[in-house]
């Protein structure tokens, strides 16, 4: 698994470097998670042909994976810092159940999956410190999440492979949109 941000040898070797600002730390954290997702996607795509065939194979997706929309204020047109930050944090909180599902889905990248999950928790904490309007952030209901996790795990092998691919793809897209938006803040 890659070394978490702030623990690489370059940081140790450069004691006089300025400490990272809050924004830099968040940026670095997201890029670290994206690297982890890339590694997980590599294993998924090597293991099955889901990555090429998912478009033709899938007729309907009821996973309700978080997605950025115009109204969320994260795109350049209609950008709204506070609304967008709330959306990013809410979306990441909603992704947590899917990241939990991913934990037993990888053979050679088990540590990587855990690293993505834990780093996302840290990212949420960073972002919550940045947000002024924490009341607007809705936390997912644990009972609903537990029920969803049971359903995800009850799918057959083929559907679980498809689900894994869709989660990784959506999480990557969500983080990339978040990164672009946060760089405008």
């Amino acid at each position: 698994a890659p070394v978490p941000p702030g623990e690489d040898s370059k940081d140790v070797a450069a004691p006089h470097r300025q400490p990272l600002t809050s924004s830099e730390r968040i940026d670095k954290q997201i890029r670290y998670i994206l690297d982890g997702i890339s590694a997980l996607r590599k294993e998924t795509c090597n293991k099955s042909n889901m990555c090429e065939s998912s478009k033709e194979a899938l007729a309907e997706n009821n996973l309700n994976l978080p997605k950025m929309a115009e109204k969320d204020g994260c795109f350049q047109s209609g950008f709204n810092e506070e609304t967008c930050l709330v959306k990013i944090i809410t979306g990441l909180l909603e992704f947590e159940v899917y990241l939990e599902y991913l934990q037993n889905r990888f053979e050679s990248s088990e540590e990587q999956a855990r690293a993505v999950q834990m780093s996302t928790k840290v990212l949420i904490q960073f972002l919550q410190k940045k947000a002024k309007n924490l009341d607007a952030i809705t936390t997912p209901d644990p009972t609903t999440n537990a029920s969803l996790l049971t359903k995800l795990q009850a799918q057959n092998q083929w559907l679980q492979d498809m689900t894994t691919h869709l989660i990784l793809r959506s999480f990557k897209e969500f983080l990339q949109s978040s990164l672009r938006a946060l760089r405008q803040m």
Partner: nanobody, 125 residues
Framework: DVQLVESGGGLVQAGGSLRLSCAAS????????MGWFRQAPGKEREFVAA????????YYADSVKGRFTISRDNAKNTVYLQMNSLKPEDTAVYYC??????????????????WGQGTQVTVSS
């Protein structure tokens, strides 16, 4: 034990119609996707149509679009396939399939958990 039982197959002339039924027992499929697949002699099993358990949305293979209609009666735990304007190339064994969770609906056979034994449809020219 879950069972899917197809009926309604038979021999029909080109241009004719048939209505296939698939009765499910052993569990309720009201929130699950259901599909029809077919297999002609010497060919792979292919997707025909599917219906979502949640939205009731329907999906069709290009080869049957506009001629076949899939529907479901949740009270009877039954799925139907109305086949109109039948062609000789529709000749195959038709299988009903069910999926147990309903988060994803796919047109791939591997995405289904339960299968019927199949009903033969023969279209003569």
């Amino acid at each position: 034990d879950v069972q899917l039982v197809e009926s309604g197959g038979g021999l029909v002339q080109a241009g004719g119609s048939l209505r296939l039924s698939c009765a499910a027992s052993g569990r309720t499929f009201s929130s699950s996707p259901m599909g029809w697949f077919r297999q002609a002699p010497g060919k792979e099993r292919e997707f025909v149509a599917a219906i979502s358990g949640r939205s009731g949305n329907t999906y069709y293979a290009d080869s049957v679009k506009g001629r076949f209609t899939i529907s479901r009666d949740n009270a009877k735990n039954t799925v139907y396939l109305q086949m109109n304007s039948l062609k000789p190339e529709d000749t195959a064994v038709y299988y009903c399939a069910g999926e147990r969770v309903g988060l994803l609906l796919t047109v791939v056979a591997e995405g289904y958990d339960y299968w019927g034994q199949g009903t033969q449809v023969t279209v003569s020219s």
